[in-house]
Amino acid sequence: QAGPLPKPTLWAEPGSVISWGNSVTIWCQGTLEAREYRLDKEESPAPWDRQNPLEPKNKARFSIPSMTEDYAGRYRCYYRSPVGWSQPSDPLELVMTGAYSKPTLSALPSPLVTSGKSVTLLCQSRSPMDTFLLIKERAAHPLLHLRSEHGAQQHQAEFPMSPVTSVHGGTYRCFSSHGFSHYLLSHPSDPLELIVSGSLEDPRPSPTRSVSTAAGPEDQPLMPTGSVPHSGLRRHWE
């Protein structure tokens, strides 16, 4: 054999973010020579599950009929062929929502913002949480994390945007999470519609003042300005 077996592809349907109680199917796709598929879950005894391949043998199905906290986590899969086991797949992170009650999302000073001005999205939780996530519907890279350091929990996180352009307009939600598992998220906040008025030919925001360079709405940089408002919170882009 010229080299190691190619790694399989791992994915989840209908997606990798699943509400509590809903069903999810994990698929592992290898090669036609596969005789067996194995799914491993990080921090669980291996193998987490084994399945025989479905015809024509190049993939296997791992079914979760009702999503609970136990299923949330990081998975990898392998397949066995007559010459041995494959390399592990890239990891799949299966996230469960509904672990905690929903936070409240608001915009300061207002969800109606003029292009070129600043707006801050504020995600608030009535109980202390250590991670807040802001997502934008239909964004290519929707997740922005603010995570507290040293286990110091917070009731809120601020997501500043400046300068605002037309690409920042849209529907946002936020989630919150406790430190004992980043794969367990709250129910989503009620949606917040951010409406940007002004020229449709807004200049793209310059990344020179960014605290962190990363993909924001529709791959436009979402520019956090200034320092993180709560000293215990650290900014993460994912």
Epitope: G98, A99, S101, R126, S127, P128, H178, L184, S186, H187
Partner: antibody, heavy 120, light 110 residues
């Protein structure tokens, strides 16, 4: 009709235990709410006992004075919340309410209350 | 810990009077403050949430104001049905709290 109904109150001796129930109707306890237990001793003010998050993890927080004597739990299949009270003392005599925290973070729905009397 | 201090504890007033009750938080609670009315033998009733928003069905003579640490409940013209005890409450839930309610203000007939 959306309501909370407490039950399980009564007379109990000092040192005894009691379990109160709070049955929800018209909404699901597994929706995105917090539910709190609040008590009111005769002629006194409202006193927060603790709260449980309706999310699947069911996080609970208690007032500092509870010190492990009371436990809040829930049974989603019965849409019911519980308050287990142990090592009861005369000063625990009160009307006990369950109440729902709405989206506005206020207690927007209250039960009618159930009276617990601790006396020998 | 967040302590809620309500004043006065008792208030004597007449029908038609303008009544103001104050609630002070020991640290900022932003606008997460609610006011309740309670009558003897009854459960509390939500009057105002988020410091100034009137709950459904509450008469417009009730109003709330404030943010941060200082909040007030005002009854613009006291009616016979308003003689009751009023409580403030902050909206946070965590494990270092003694109580989430203020001590109460009893509004009685002068």
């Amino acid at each position: 009709e959306v309501q909370l109904v407490e039950s399980g109150g009564g007379l109990v001796q000092p040192g005894g235990s009691l379990r109160l129930s709070c049955a929800a109707s018209g909404f699901s306890l597994s929706s995105s709410y917090w539910i709190s237990w609040v008590r009111q001793a005769p002629g006194k003010g409202l006193e927060w006992i603790g709260s449980i998050d309706s999310g699947s993890v069911g996080i609970t927080y208690y007032a500092t004075w509870v010190k492990g004597r009371f436990t809040i739990s829930r049974d989603n299949s019965k849409n019911t919340l519980y308050l287990q009270m142990n090592s009861l003392r005369a000063e625990d005599t009160a009307v006990y309410y369950c109440a729902r925290h709405g989206d506005n973070w206020a207690l927007d729905l209250w039960g009618q209350g159930t009276l617990v009397t601790v006396s020998s | 810990d967040i302590q809620m201090t309500q004043s006065p504890s008792t208030l004597s007033a007449s029908v038609g009077d303008r009544v103001t009750i104050t609630c002070r938080a020991s640290q900022s609670i932003v606008s997460w403050l609610a006011w309740y009315q309670q009558k003897p033998g009854k459960a509390p009733k939500l009057l105002i949430y988020k410091a100034s928003t009137l709950a459904s069905g509450v008469p417009s003579r009730f109003s709330g104001s404030g943010s941060g640490t200082e909040f007030t409940l005002t009854i613009s013209s006291l009616q016979p049905d308003d003689f009751a005890t009023y409580y403030c409450q902050h909206g946070y839930i965590r494990g270092d709290l003694d109580n989430v309610f203020g001590g109460g203000t009893k509004v009685e007939i002068k």
